[in-house]
Amino acid sequence: KFSKQSWGLENEALIVRCPRQGKSSYIVDWYYSQTNKSIPTQERNRVFASGQLLKFLPAEVADSGIYTCIVRSPTFNRTGYANVTIYKKQPDCNVPDYLMYSTVSGSEKNSKIYCPTIDLYNWTAPLEWFKNCQALQGSRYKAHKSFLVIDNVMTDDAGDYTCKFIHNENGANYSVTATRSFTVKDEQGFSLFPVIRAPAHNETKEVEIGENTNLTCSACFGKGAQFLATVQWQLNGNKITDFSEPRIQQEEGQNQSFSNGLACVNTVLRIADVKEEDLLLRYDCLALNLHGLRRHTIRLSRK
């Protein structure tokens, strides 16, 4: 659980998260386990630590090994291990099993292929996608945010899909690729106009000034796999990305399915160090699928 395998290709960026999670305020120290040597935090180094993240910019085969992260709260120190392996670039198109991320399944209704580990990187759209090393072209393929959507999925769409993107660190660009298998399954399901489970419409949440708070937008879209189902937050009608306030961050939506088969998505809005001006904002939870858009509004009030 607290030893995590990570891998990458030489001359590409690799970013690894400490498998031991803690609050964002906790200090994280990184060490190279074999030598117990501390990993520097200065960004001028090719390999450096940045809080919960260990960055190889770019990675070299010699970086392979076990890295220790120690997360320090005021009273507890907890240890995690990142087992990092950097491989030489493959001369041919074949992607070996040890470079593959988990297999995902899709169906006619839901053909989303998420780009693995991308949330760790500072990247900008669009992603490039390849199937069995061939660049994907044509209107059936849509690169949307961090995933690929395939229209009218057929059995021969199964295969190995590689996403390629650029990580930017202090103005320098580094390439990253990640590959996973996609299988096609037949699935009976249906989609509905989105139903927002939380928050209630026109809800008010009490918060403490100076504390952190989370708002969860949770919506369900039908049964079984869904072709398009997004849940996101808006601030005063603007996208979170357009609202340049680093204290307010939206997590990528987490898929959830319940015992009754409902397909739901949760997206959390994290607000750090709540300020008075946050109480003036309108927070809209938006749920969108092919049937349409539903919006619930929540406001913050001082406790």
């Epitope: 607290f2 609050k23 709260s73 009273t75 507890f76």
Partner: antibody, heavy 123, light 107 residues
């Protein structure tokens, strides 16, 4: 100094209700997960319930699910346990305790405990 | 539910002796295991977390080891104040569970 002080215990008849409180001081109560643990006379420790720091997620032992409700009032630095449909087997000392790590989706140890309040269910 | 089984139920030793307490989990808990000490009429006190780390203020004579399903709490040289009941607890998943306890008593 971290302190947890339970109150609200006492003698109650089977089928009755009781509400336990735990007053916290010496730390920023609202950011910590809080827990109720009980100990029947002469027996071991049994986890009862956990509530996340933001007051969102709650977790219950199967033995109390549907009968007990954990809640908190962060403005009053107080943790509660509402106990309904009490049974003889609920007789125990009830402790409130703090989880000092508190990251969503995970659990940790209990670093501070109150001295406990005794609940006796008997006719 | 993960069941924790502690052995022995009672350990009779003299001050200065070494105490070895065992805790076995019904399935792997990685290193998500803690040890507590409880004296009569008192609340439990945290000794060890993450299987082998001593909590703040706990004397060095207490040490924990193990991973997965088999864990050990060792008291290298018993002091008079160490005679108490010791519980292990797993926190890898809910429900959080405790062992039934090992009583360390004066021989």
């Amino acid at each position: 100094e971290v302190q947890l002080l339970e109150s609200g215990g006492g003698l109650v008849q089977p089928g009755g209700s009781l509400r336990l409180s735990c007053a916290a001081s010496g730390f920023t109560f609202s950011i910590y997960d809080m827990i109720w643990v009980r100990q029947a006379p002469g027996k071991g420790l049994e986890w009862v319930s956990t509530i996340r720091g933001e007051g969102g997620s709650t977790y219950y032992a199967d033995s109390v699910k549907g009968r007990f409700t954990i809640s908190r009032d962060n403005s009053k630095n107080t943790l509660y346990l509402q106990m309904n449909s009490l049974r003889a087997e609920d007789t125990a000392v009830y402790y409130c305790a703090r989880d000092p790590w508190s990251t969503e989706g995970s659990f940790f140890v209990l670093d501070y405990w109150g001295q406990g309040t005794l609940v006796t269910v008997s006719s | 539910e993960i069941v924790l089984t502690q052995s022995p139920a009672t350990l009779s030793l003299s001050p200065g002796e070494r105490a070895t307490l065992s805790c076995r989990a019904s399935q792997s808990v990685d290193d998500d295991l803690a040890w507590y000490q409880q004296k009569p009429g008192q609340a439990p006190r945290l000794l060890i977390y993450d299987a082998s780390n001593r909590a703040t203020g706990i004397p060095a004579r207490f040490s924990g080891s193990g991973s997965g399903t088999d864990f050990t709490l060792t008291i290298s040289s018993l002091e008079p104040e160490d005679f108490a009941v010791y519980y292990c607890q797993q926190y890898i998943t809910a429900p959080l569970t405790f062992g039934q306890g090992t009583k360390v008593e004066i021989k």
